[in-house]
Interface confidence: low
């Protein structure tokens, strides 16, 4: 009679995480008498997965009724597969012995690979804001996927980016993998409404890639431009000087008026006009009673934006000879004047 052969017909089996894996094994003979066992791995460190003779293996079920007379099918099913279950499984026939059974013959092994979906990509931007024409870095991370093959792309407003570096870890074999990518993005003035997208494609996603996004509004600071002008007034003893603060982002802005270098008034921008590109405009004005001044006045509009160093613009208000002869009190009037988007 031909010697018993252990047949594992599939060299490899690929299963999605959470599913059950069926590992097939058949014997060509009922002789010799003795149990079969399933192991993961080979050699001294192999892990027992199923023992026909004894033990409790809650995730393992046999495909056939092993106690049935003349049964030669020793296939098993392992439920709720995770990436940690990946490896090569061996179906091993033992010969009945005393006191211990003796290993008789092993199958060629079936490699179980587990397809695990990558986690949702998490995109994070720079810790501090940067101004237009500077380069900022965004990172994208995803974890827990298998197999290792994965594709990552970056987009800015739908346009694919090319200045990025990607690593998949670990470099060697592993039950699951992580991907980490850093993209460098050049900021432009119009990027308040821009978005960067990290897109990940993997065999488990069936052509429907995962996307993570970050808004450039969190990364950009657009410094304001200042313009100080004198508005025409009907009353000849009054001057109306306005400070137009334009195209800034984010909102946080504090404005200080100075007369000849002395602080006159400080106000915080509240009612802002939003431009189409997401930046803001704001206007403040100062009403000056020119009769109160015998000499020319330098009015300075000083703006502190988003905690940055203050920028300022000055305006020299000329006092006519007639006004210099008649002194009187100076009045200040603050107003928030809406302005149309530029």
């Amino acid at each position: 009679e031909d010697e018993l052969q252990v047949i594992q017909p599939e060299k490899s089996v690929s299963v999605a995480a959470g599913e059950s894996a069926t590992l097939r094994c058949a014997m060509t003979s009922l002789i010799p008498v003795g149990p079969i066992m399933w192991f993961r791995g080979a050699g001294a460190g192999r892990e027992l997965i199923y023992n026909q003779k004894e033990g409790h293996f809650p995730r393992v079920t046999t495909v056939s009724e092993l106690t049935k007379r003349n049964n030669l099918d020793f296939s098993i099913s392992i439920s709720n597969i995770t990436p940690a279950d990946a490896g090569t499984y061996y179906c091993v026939k033992f010969r009945k012995g005393s006191p211990d059974d003796v290993e008789f013959k092993s199958g060629a092994g079936t490699e179980l690979s587990v397809r695990a979906k990558p986690s949702a990509p998490v995109v994070s931007g720079p810790a501090v804001r940067a101004t237009p024409e500077h380069t900022v870095s965004f990172t994208c991370e995803s974890h827990g996927f298998s197999p290792r093959d994965i594709t990552l792309k970056w987009f800015k407003n739908g346009n694919e980016l090319s200045d990025f570096q990607t690593n998949v870890d670990p470099a060697g074999d592993s039950v699951s993998y992580s991907i980490h990518s850093t993209a460098r993005v050049v900021l432009t003035r119009g990027d308040v409404h821009s978005q960067v997208i990290c897109e990940i494609a993997h065999i488990t996603l069936q052509g429907d890639p995962l996307r993570g996004t970050a808004n450039l509004s969190e990364a950009i600071r657009v410094p304001p431009t200042l313009e100080v002008t004198q508005q025409p007034m009907r009353a000849e003893n009054q001057a109306n000087v306005t400070c137009q603060v334009s195209n800034f982002y984010p909102r946080g802005l504090q404005l200080t008026w100075l007369e000849n270098g002395n602080v006159s008034r400080t106000e915080t921008a509240s009612t802002l006009i939003e431009n189409k590109d997401g930046t803001y405009n704001w206007m403040s004005w100062l009403l000056v009673n020119t009769c109160a001044h015998r000499d020319d006045v330098v009015l300075t509009c000083q703006v502190e934006h988003d905690g940055q160093q203050a920028v300022s613009k000055s305006y020299a208000l000329e006092i006519s000879a007639h006004q210099k002869e008649h002194g009187s009190d100076i009045t200040h009037e603050a107003a928030l004047a809406p302005t149309a988007p530029l």
Epitope: T135, N159, S162, Q165, R184
Partner: antibody, heavy 123, light 107 residues
Amino acid sequence: QIQLVQSGPELKKPGETVKISCKASGYTFTTYGMSWVKQAPGKGLKWMVWINTYSGVPTYADDFKGRFAFSLETSASTSYLQINNLKNEDTATYFCARDPHYYGSSPAWFVYWGQGTLVTVSA
Amino acid sequence: DIVMTQSQKFMSTTIGDRVSITCEASQIVGIAVAWYQQKPGQSPKLLIYSASNRYTGVPDRFTGSGSGTDFTLTISNMQSEDLANYFCQQYSAYPFTFGSGTKLEVK
């Protein structure tokens, strides 16, 4: 060490087809993307395509869509460039160049270059 | 496409000179610029990447600078072996484009 070895020079007539190769050694072929770059005699460099060697998917420059076919034989660690219906303006040296980044990145600058293959198209 | 303009096709130099080769991008490319040296009959050789990073083994007389749209390759102490063609390349956006080249010649 890392090497990109290209096939030898080719002399072809207009309308013919040429296929040139770039064999990589010294690293795992599928972990770094590959680009092809054209240099006409006495002229500058023109990037043609980038191939993701993991997926085999090419990203073309617009000027090189149509008559140009790029393929891989990963088991032989080789990238191929095929030009169909050759024209006189295809006369050039064609370089293959490897990405600097490990796995999955887009191309950027090029550290490793093949020695170049001169394709001459003449009636 | 982003156009990389190297306005000087040829530059005459003397050994020991300080030489600056410029490259201008038609739109902002950040620091996604590399510089190559090419000698007749040879493949290009990487000198600088990310605008200012000198590649391993490149002599420190080669320095790269610039960001945004204007980039410069400087050779601080010109040597005879530096007589070659120099190309800039942007990798900020597809398709990647090279400058037309600047050839250094001896006076």
